[in-house]
């Protein structure tokens, strides 16, 4: 098997990516400048640490989490980094254009980098459903479309529903999941004969995927608290997320054992289920008043995640062509919905408590937000899927799905592994 890129893609990718990068540099040159105000340096460092946590989550956490394929681990990690780097640049510009451009120039702050990293994270969640079936040129398209769709979704939700940064970013779980699933649905499904082994997991890549899960597990409290405006909210968010992910780990490992006839633990279940609590509490992490509630949520989320990992892959593999180990998409879609439902329950309790008879209206607003997120995710995902199917991108042949050798130079290997 040739280790070279197909000649046409070799021309297409560098030209496409470098032209795009040049365009981004020009946009930054003409339309952006740094926040000139002098800040308290200690505060600046503390603020940077939140952004650093998010970058670690994205680059190492999601990068390695998706690297469990036996013959696609290199590509998973490196392509994730590529998408993150590109996604952050475009997200900073887009957020700036959408929120502050009328004033003339986009002011870049640590907060805008934080927002951009979270927007780029959306792509890294979605791409789990298509990694191995697309090349870098196609991934560039996916990054541009998804970041643009998410940016516009956030602006629309912010303007129409008057939601804050945290609330409108927490739709990221549902948005990213449905976007990824709809892109996957558009791509060629069946794995041809002879390539079934490539989408299987192997011990060393599975270990690196577990490393990714551990990084995500450690930094999930930072993700859930990054966009909250007061110290008390951030503190509550950190505590509640921590309790939820702690319980979901215990649930994931014990639930995985329970789900297996011989009581064995599945690596794939554990990779995703350890994060379940963090996703489920995301929307309401700052509002949960007691640790035990966050822990119960972590428990429920862990069970849903393990249950989903047991029963959904068959369906996803048949309908969407998503391999068994790429379970982030449906995992996040279920858990994201759980998180949104929990918030709606809190909303009902709040309006009943206030006794102002606005329950229906408030719930309708929240359901409207969620529906809008799902609809935009599905529509932009389908659009992306259709774009990725264009011949211009020279997509990998089905026989070369999940194969690092299509993209990477391995000097010590003549053919195969």
């Amino acid at each position: 098997m040739s280790s070279k890129y197909p000649r046409s893609v070799r021309r297409c990718l560098p030209l496409w990516a470098l032209t795009l990068e040049a365009a981004l540099i020009l946009l930054f040159y003409f339309f952006t400048h740094y926040d000139a105000s002098l800040e308290d340096q200690k505060g600046l460092v503390a603020s940077y640490q939140v952004g650093q946590d998010l970058t670690v989550m994205a680059a190492i956490g999601l990068g390695f989490l998706t690297s469990s394929f036996r013959r696609h681990s290199w590509s998973s990690v490196a392509f994730n980094l590529f998408m993150l780097a590109l996604g952050v640049q475009w997200a900073i510009l887009l957020d700036g254009f959408l929120s502050q451009f009328p004033s003339g120039k986009v002011v870049i702050t640590l907060f805008s980098i934080r927002l951009a990293t979270m927007s780029a994270l959306s792509v890294l969640i979605s791409v789990d459903a298509v990694l191995g079936k697309v090349n870098l040129a196609q991934l560039v398209v996916m990054v541009l479309v998804e970041v643009t769709a998410l940016g516009n979704l956030r602006m629309v939700i912010s303007n129409i529903f008057n939601t804050d940064y945290h609330m409108n970013m927490m739709h990221i779980y549902v948005f990213a999941a449905y976007f990824g699933l709809s892109v996957a649905w558009c791509l060629p499904k069946p794995l041809p004969e002879g390539t079934e082994d490539k989408d299987q997991t192997a011990t060393i890549p599975s270990l690196s995927a577990m490393l990714g899960a551990l990084f995500l597990w450690m930094f999930w409290p930072s993700f859930n608290s990054a966009l909250l405006r007061s110290p008390i909210e951030r503190k509550n968010a950190v505590f509640n997320t921590y309790y939820a992910v702690a319980v979901s780990v215990v649930t994931a490992i014990s639930g995985s054992s329970l789900a297996h006839p011989q009581g064995k633990i599945s690596k794939t279940y554990v990779h995703s289920a350890v994060l379940a609590g963090g996703v489920a509490v995301g929307t309401s992490c700052h509002l949960i008043p007691s640790p035990w509630l966050a822990m119960v949520l972590g428990l429920v989320a862990g069970l849903i995640s393990v249950g989903g990992a047991k029963y959904l892959p068959g369906c996803c593999n048949r309908v969407l062509g998503i391999p068994h180990s790429s379970i982030m998409g449906y995992n996040f879609s279920l858990l994201g919905l759980l998180g949104e439902i929990i918030y709606i329950v809190l909303l009902v309790l709040d309006t009943v408590g206030a006794g102002n008879g606005m329950i229906g209206f408030q719930v309708l607003l929240s359901i409207g937000e969620l529906s809008l997120a799902i609809v935009i995710a599905l529509m932009s995902g389908l659009l992306t899927g259709l774009l990725l199917n264009l011949k211009i991108w020279k997509a990998p042949h089905e026989a070369k799905y999940f194969d690092d050798q299509v993209f990477w130079k391995f000097p010590h290997l003549a053919v195969g592994f």
Epitope: V50, F111, S158, F161, D164, S230, L287, L346, T351, A354
Partner: antibody, heavy 125, light 105 residues
Amino acid sequence: QVKLLESGGGVVQPGRSLRLSCIASGFTLRNYAMHWVRQAPGKGLEWVAGIWFDGSNKNYADSVKGRFTISRDNSKNTLFLHMNSLRAEDTATYYCARERAIRGISRYNYYMDVWGKGTTVTVSS
Amino acid sequence: VMTQSPSSLSASVGDRVTITCRASQSIRSSLNWYQQKPGKAPKVLIYAASSLQSGVPSRFSGRGSGTDFTLTISSLQPEDFATYYCQQSSSSSWTFGQGTKVEIK
């Protein structure tokens, strides 16, 4: 005693710059988001700008976007408002105010609980 | 945009006074009421549409959610003659109503 004291106001020509300061006492500034609010003579209150507790995020009213910059130095317990390209319509009393966050069941509620006495800015040629 | 009505009203001591504030779009319960006396800084009365700030007399009350809100003074006292402002804190850019001046009849 919790107090906010503004300073830096005065008479300035259109197009020039001015920097307002607000020193907090009786509480730790780094635990609170802060705001600037102004009131033109004989007119109502107008929110000007806000900054998060850690300085990571800043928001501005459309009327001052691109001209005014809010910043803070938590180590000195001080809030700033840098005003550039001043116009006659920026003439007002400028108040700094502390934001309080209270948890409701489904969202946090924010309001300004402590206000300074204000400093007067007059933009005139 | 926050629209307050009336812009001014005359009332006597002991009267029940109601001021309304309407938001151009839903702000849920993110509405606060402030009182300002001439030459003084504003003072918060009600936050989150209906919660009374500590130290504020119980004759002040707030109601509403979504787009329509009211501030009620159940029995007007001499010290209540002032200008009242509503303010939304729902979006990242806060806005005030234009104010309602309560004068002695």
